[in-house]
Interface confidence: medium
């Protein structure tokens, strides 16, 4: 009797930013819930949290230094991650907990999403490129 989560198997962050959508087999309307995104096979790093309460505005925060935002759909939460580094390429797992009304619900562990961060070219193109080869 757990919530099922669907995630994209892989996303590429070309501009050091990515939208990761977590789709749930559960309608979050008029529920108090905590949706979170976790980094690593062991889910050791909590990247971002979206806290939803039907009587208040959505709260989005990261305690681990990630630049994140979140959007809520009836059966989904989308995490928008910015300023990602190449070395943050990893597998990311969506987690959902419905705290109220009881009973407490959480999800079966999903398959996760591999986010491949392709860094921007930090070296500017030369103003005067050398002669092109024939």
């Amino acid at each position: 009797n757990k919530i099922l989560v669907k995630q994209s198997p892989m996303l590429v962050a070309y501009d050091n930013a990515v939208n990761l959508s977590c789709k749930y087999s559960y309608n979050l309307f008029s529920r108090e819930f905590r949706a979170s995104l976790h980094k690593g096979l062991d889910s050791a790093v909590e990247v971002c949290v979206v806290y939803g309460n039907y009587s208040q505005q959505l709260q989005v925060y990261s305690k681990t230094g990630f630049n994140c935002d979140g959007k809520l759909g009836n059966e989904s939460v989308t995490f928008y991650l910015q300023n990602l580094y190449v070395n943050q390429t990893d597998i990311y797992f969506c987690k959902i907990e419905v705290m109220y009304p009881p009973p407490y619900l959480d999800n079966e562990k999903s398959n996760g999403t591999i986010i491949h961060v392709k860094g921007k070219h930090l070296c500017p193109s030369p103003l005067f490129p050398g002669p092109s080869k024939p």
Partner: nanobody, 119 residues
Framework: EVQLVESGGGLVQPGGSLRLSCAAS????????IGWVRRAPGKEEELVAY????????RYADSVKGRFTISADTSKNTAYLQMNSLRAEDTAVYYC????????????WGQGTTVTVSS
């Protein structure tokens, strides 16, 4: 074996205080939410307070807001209900229940502890 054991009930005068304890064994309270539910004759069962210890989420019934405080000590695997400014209408049997998701609602119940508020 999973068990929830309540204690701390008793007879108290109106305006008095009691602290109920709910000791859990066989599971970790960090993995669930714990609620205090009361049952009184002729009244509907009421979920008075609720806590999710993993991130400190709490919620209270309007009838007890500002008077009751729910807390949890995960190192002791125990939840507490501090009851202040008690009233006659708080008289009931208080149960703690594990609110982990199951098909049938509450997964586990304690045996209950009786609170009587009377002068």
């Amino acid at each position: 074996e999973v068990q929830l054991v309540e204690s701390g009930g008793g007879l108290v005068q109106p305006g008095g205080s009691l602290r109920l304890s709910c000791a859990a064994s066989g599971f970790n309270i960090k993995d669930t939410c714990i609620g205090w539910v009361r049952r009184a004759p002729g009244k509907e069962e009421e979920l008075v307070a609720y806590i999710c210890p993993s991130h400190g989420y709490t919620r209270y019934a309007d009838s007890v807001k500002g008077r009751f405080t729910i807390s949890a000590d995960t190192s002791k695997n125990t939840a507490y209900l501090q009851m202040n400014s008690l009233r006659a209408e708080d008289t009931a049997v208080y149960y703690c229940a594990d609110h982990k998701n199951t098909q049938w609602g509450y997964a586990y119940w304690g045996q209950g502890t009786t609170v009587t508020v009377s002068s």
